[in-house]
């Protein structure tokens, strides 16, 4: 069971300082952006991180949403990352959900965050370059210290 708590507005970056944003096709991509670019591209660069209390505490349970014309929420259904047109629900009556991730700081690096899927244990949000794109994907952690699954989260409130 997950119950919604408060939400915050955040900019999410990978460890190469690329900014996560939502493309016109509602796809999450990372790109090099100046602070000015980041502001100019809002709200596509501003993510709503909603925190949830968890009946089985496993880290800070969160959803990640964005509000452009409508609110869309990040999902890892079938291990494919996409934004689905939905509000983060007030309650989720299950111990797993495709939209719930456990946000944890990286041991020894309090400013670096990881997001583990509640649906797929051991799978994390990651940034990987595929052809010309820096994509947000779901990735099985295959090595300790994998920088691709680490992010910085800058509060914009």
């Amino acid at each position: 069971y997950f119950g919604k708590l408060e939400s915050k507005l955040s900019v999410i970056r990978n460890l190469n300082d690329q900014v996560l944003f939502i493309d016109q096709g509602n796809r999450p991509l990372f790109e090099d952006m100046t602070d000015s670019d980041c502001r100019d591209n809002a709200p596509r660069t501003i993510f709503i991180i909603s925190m949830y209390k968890d009946s089985q505490p496993r880290g800070m349970a969160v959803t990640i949403s964005v509000k452009c014309e409508k609110i869309s929420t990040l999902s890892c259904e079938n291990k494919i990352i996409s934004f689905k047109e939905m509000n983060p629900p007030d309650n989720i009556k299950d111990t797993k959900s495709d939209i719930i991730f456990f946000q944890r700081s990286v041991p020894g690096h309090d400013n670096k965050m990881q997001f583990e899927s509640s649906s797929y244990e051991g799978y994390f949000l990651a940034c990987e370059k595929e052809r010309d794109l820096f994509k947000l994907i779901l990735k099985k952690e295959d090595e300790l210290g994998d920088r691709s699954i680490m992010f910085t989260v800058q509060n914009e409130d």
Epitope: D23, N78, K79, E128, E130, K139
Partner: antibody
Framework: QLQLQESGPGLVKPSETLSLTCTVS??????????WGWIRQPPGKGLEWIGS???????YYNPSLKSRVTISVDTPKNQFSLKLNSVTAADTAVYYC????????????WGQGTLATVSS | EIVLTQSPGTLSLSPGERATLSCRAS???????LNWYQQKPGQAPRLLIY???SRATGIPDRFSGSGSGTDFTLTISSLEPEDFVVYYC?????????FGQGTKLEIN
């Protein structure tokens, strides 16, 4: 609704260059999240990926065809093109153009295909 | 370059039966970038399954995909007469795409 249409000569002589163009309608070719690909199918055989191009011009080719293939894009015309040089009878095939969605690298929209025959 | 091998080459079954088509990769397919297509005679292929599991828009739920790593399966739970055509798997890895050689589903 997105539509792709292949065009080009149906007959090419051996050792010459096969040239095809794909015209995209119902959507813009200059999207960040899509690539544009060519796939061929010899008569009675399976599908073979030839290559894909991004709207900014970067190309990715089948290693077995790379030395003979050039794919280019004309964003203002919403078209992309295939050139295959030094053709032989083995290049006779139905040639398809398709959109490749980067979410799962899947060909989700296809043209109806055009038969290119290599013969003297 | 990853090579995909589909088996069997031809599968003979009757309408209403369950079909299991296999696609095996020469190396592990990253991030489940394994897709399935159906091709009817004289037509372009049509996307059925993407990302190993997800049904494309408008595809009936009798089609399902499974697998990971090097072994993937397309299952058709109860065959309809129009399902007796050719099926291809396709993968993406290291910027390169490739297709399997196809499985022909024929009426027994």
């Amino acid at each position: 609704q997105l539509q792709l249409q292949e065009s080009g000569p149906g007959l090419v002589k051996p050792s010459e260059t096969l040239s095809l163009t794909c015209t995209v309608s119902g959507g813009s070719i200059d999207s960040r999240i899509y690539y544009w690909g060519w796939i061929r199918q010899p008569p009675g055989k399976g599908l073979e990926w030839i290559g894909s191009i991004y709207y900014r011009g970067s190309t990715y080719y089948n290693p077995s065809l790379k030395s003979r293939v050039t794919i280019s894009v004309d964003t203002p015309k919403n078209q992309f093109s295939l050139k295959l040089n030094s053709v032989t009878a083995a290049d006779t095939a139905v040639y398809y153009c398709a959109r490749e969605d980067s979410s799962a690298w899947v060909f989700d929209y296809w043209g109806q295909g055009t038969l290119a025959t290599v013969s003297s | 370059e990853i090579v995909l091998t589909q088996s069997p080459g031809t599968l003979s079954l009757s309408p209403g039966e369950r079909a299991t088509l296999s696609c095996r990769a020469s190396q592990s397919v990253r991030n489940n970038y394994l897709n399935w297509y159906q091709q009817k005679p004289g037509q372009a292929p049509r996307l059925l399954i993407y990302g190993a599991f997800s049904r494309a828009t408008g595809i009936p739920d009798r089609f399902s995909g499974s697998g990971s790593g090097t072994d993937f399966t397309l299952t058709i739970s109860s065959l309809e007469p129009e399902d007796f055509v050719v099926y291809y798997c396709q993968q993406y890895g290291n910027s390169i795409d490739s297709f399997g050689q196809g499985t022909k589903l024929e009426i027994n």
